[in-house]
Interface confidence: medium
């Protein structure tokens, strides 16, 4: 069967969300990840989308991920505008309304969003084959 | 063709206000957030303030929260940049910024030093 578009979508989101770093993906969020085993794909989802939601909800006028400069600034801004497009596509690749996140393990989300891209072309490729 | 023009920079007293603009022109003002950003002597750019393109969402650094207020009015083209409490730490040249994905066109700057 054909992969979904919001599927290529993602993993261009994630590739280009992983190739710089900012001033905050050193931050840690909620590791859904370490204890995955029981969970659904569509679980998966919807959670790793409301872990995102809870960063840039947190941290979308941080001054200290803002940083001092105008590239940081606008790094930062990129960031979440990339983010909120991630958590959008998730969300439509869920297709739950909602999902608990309760783990108490923390990644950094550079972490996070690599373990997230490996989770997505793992997917693209046995639905691409 | 580009442009910006800054004016209302001086000299002031510590504790003092001023109100700089920025008149823009050869860009669909209305379309693009705007920011102000400033050099102090010797010093490296540093953002100041950011505002989006309908002037409903606002950013401030944290040296500035609190004593400056961005605004816009797009219906003039301009974007204000009202700052009280000076410090003598807010010298500098004060630079307004066209924002799209980056900083991508500047005005010439107006000076603003605060001493007594």
């Known amino acids: 069967h054909k992969c979904d578009i919001t599927l290529q979508e993602i993993i261009k989101t994630l590739n280009s969300l992983t190739e710089q770093k900012t001033l905050c993906t050193e931050l840690t969020v909620t590791d859904i990840f370490a204890a995955s085993k029981n969970t659904t794909e569509k679980e998966t989802f919807c959670r790793a989308a409301t872990v995102l939601r809870q960063f840039y909800s947190h941290h979308e006028k941080d001054t200290r991920c803002l940083g001092a400069t105008a590239q940081q600034f606008h790094r930062h801004k990129q960031l979440i505008r990339f983010l909120k497009r991630l958590d959008r596509n998730l969300w439509g690749l869920a297709g739950l309304n909602s999902c608990p996140v309760k783990e108490a393990n923390q990644s950094t989300l550079e972490n996070f969003l690599e373990r997230l891209k490996t989770i997505m072309r793992e997917k693209y490729s046995k639905c691409s084959s | 063709e580009v442009q910006l023009l800054e004016s209302g920079g001086g000299l002031v007293q510590p504790g003092g206000s001023l109100r700089l603009s920025c008149a823009a022109s050869g860009f669909t003002f209305r379309n693009y957030g705007m920011a102000w950003v400033r050099q102090a002597p010797g010093k490296g750019l540093e953002w100041v303030s950011w505002?989006?393109?309908?002037?409903?969402?606002?950013y401030y650094a944290d040296s500035v929260k609190g004593r400056f207020t961005i605004s816009r009015d797009n219906s003039k083209n301009t974007l204000y940049l009202q700052m009280n409490s000076l410090r003598a730490e807010d010298t500098a040249v004060y630079y307004c910024?066209?924002?799209?994905?980056?900083?991508?066109?500047w005005g010439q700057g107006t000076l603003v030093t605060v001493s007594s």
């Open positions: 910024a066209k924002s799209a994905g980056r900083f991508d066109y």
């Open positions: 505002i989006d393109a309908s002037g409903t969402e606002t």
